[in-house]
């Protein structure tokens, strides 16, 4: 149902990385505008992005209130310039989004190697603990704060002079690996949430190599 000059939104899609969460939909509006509502399964509807001509709405502020909740959004279509107009059923045309549980579904952003330090034949590689928009006690939480031990990192490393890679894993943000003295190594990391069945892994971090600025070398 709905007025003759509005069409319902479709292809409602959640785009979420490290809890930054945007709802996208189609079509590009022609003589119509949209309003989005979001709710938890048991909560009240909250309106966002009022009468917008955009086809996306940033819902981060709502979902970060409880990232373990399951959310549902809906997109209402109104005739441009006549937003009080309703459909034949007495309410505006709308379409529901798929359900979205941020903790289980947000994509893991590409990690960054913060630093590496060589001490003799050991290298300590540290992964940057990225800040999220999830807040607790007025402080932004890091990815590790949110996921705890549910988040692990996989390190790929290899001698600059060869192609054979090795791997290690950690449930902190640090790796301590053995290396051959006098060899330069390159590193890349990947974030993983083993308990998930989808969106389990991030893309690989940019490669960082010894002998470049980011690291520190100490001969002991």
């Amino acid at each position: 149902s709905g007025t003759t000059n509005t069409v319902a939104a479709y292809n409602l899609t959640w785009k979420s990385t490290n809890f930054k969460t945007i709802l996208e939909w189609e079509p590009k509006p022609v003589n119509q505008v949209y309003t989005v509502q979001i709710s938890t399964k048991s909560g009240d509807w909250k309106s966002k992005c009022f009468y917008t001509t955009d086809t996306e709405c940033d819902l981060t502020d709502e979902i970060v209130k409880d990232v373990k909740q399951t959310y549902l959004a809906r997109v209402f279509s109104y005739p441009a310039g006549n937003v009080e107009s309703t459909g034949s059923a007495g309410e505006p045309l709308y379409e529901n989004s798929p359900e979205f549980t941020p903790y289980l579904e947000t994509n893991l952003g590409q990690p960054t190697i913060q630093s590496f330090e060589q001490v003799g034949t050991k290298v300590n590689v540290t992964v940057e603990d990225e800040r999220t928009l999830v807040r607790r006690n007025n402080t932004f939480l890091s990815l590790r704060d949110v996921f705890g031990k549910d988040l692990i990192y996989t390190l790929y490393y290899w001698k600059s002079s060869s192609s054979g890679k090795k791997t290690a894993k950690t449930n902190t943000n640090e790796f301590l690996i053995d290396v051959d003295k006098g060899e330069n190594y390159c590193f890349s990391v990947q974030a993983v949430i083993p308990s998930r069945t989808v969106n389990r892994k991030s893309t690989d971090s940019p490669v960082e190599c010894m002998g470049q600025e980011k690291g520190e070398f100490r001969e002991i």
Partner: antibody
Framework: QVQLVQSGGGVVQPGRLLRLSCKAS????????MHWVRQAPGKGLEWIGL????????IYDPKFQGRFSISADTSKNTAFLQMDSLRPEDTAVYYC??????????WGQGTPVTVSS | DIQMTQSPSSLSASVGDRVTITCKAS??????LNWYQQKPWKAPKTLIY???SLADGVPSRFSGSGSGTDYTFTISSLQPEDIATYYC?????????FGQGTKLEIT
């Protein structure tokens, strides 16, 4: 449900090559690491290597590096183990396994490879 | 590379007995240790992961303990269906390495 179905084993002459397949169903291999493990007759388990099918990263036990090659075709949801210059001591049952990053949670049924002239 | 030394290589026990198998790593593996059960002509099955966690669907008579380099696998009350070979596996860093296996028999 999750399944790994292996194929490609058999009897092969020394020096030849063989490619084993591990066809996954019930999940997308891009979301997991895929491993190959072998077991010679009457012996223990031996880890060969792994692949991250999403980016093609491969890691091998150094003793298999060069002669064995792991690959994946995400469009076919299948992982492969190619073994070159096969030797009699490569005779074993070869298993593929899915790694959820905690443990190998699903295994293929195993495929026997016999290297003999 | 990390070496895993598993003992004993075989053991015989009676139904109801408490059975213990150990694995010693050549360096700290930070609890990245799993225990697998393998029955003849079958693929291995995970019993314990991250040294102490019970895998889904595994009976509670199986348990694991340990940290650093020393790990223990225990069957609190041996059942006839537990006849199998048991392996530890370290997966903290590559190459992943299995223990040599422990063949468990019932007397």
């Amino acid at each position: 449900q999750v399944q790994l179905v292996q194929s490609g084993g058999g009897v092969v002459q020394p020096g030849r090559l063989l490619r084993l397949s591990c066809k996954a169903s019930g999940f997308n291999i891009k979301d997991y690491y895929m491993h190959w493990v072998r077991q010679a007759p009457g012996k223990g388990l031996e880890w060969i290597g792994l692949i991250d099918p999403e980016n093609g990263n491969t890691i091998y036990d150094p003793k298999f590096q060069g002669r064995f090659s792991i690959s994946a075709d995400t469009s076919k949801n299948t992982a492969f183990l190619q073994m070159d210059s096969l030797r009699p001591e490569d005779t074993a049952v070869y298993y593929c396994a899915r790694d959820n990053s905690y443990y190998f949670d699903y295994w293929g049924q195993g495929t026997p490879v016999t290297v003999s002239s | 590379d990390i070496q895993m030394t598993q003992s004993p290589s075989s053991l015989s026990a009676s139904v109801g007995d408490r059975v213990t198998i150990t694995c010693k790593a050549s360096q700290d593996i930070r609890k990245y240790l799993n225990w697998y059960q393998q029955k003849p002509w079958k693929a291995p099955k995970t019993l314990i992961y991250y040294a102490t966690s019970l895998a889904d669907g595994v009976p509670s008579r199986f348990s694991g303990s340990g940290s650093g380099t020393d790990y223990t696998f225990t069957i609190s009350s041996l059942q006839p269906e537990d006849i199998a070979t048991y392996y530890c596996l370290q997966h903290g860093e590559s190459p992943y390495t299995f223990g040599q296996g422990t063949k468990l028999e019932i007397t």
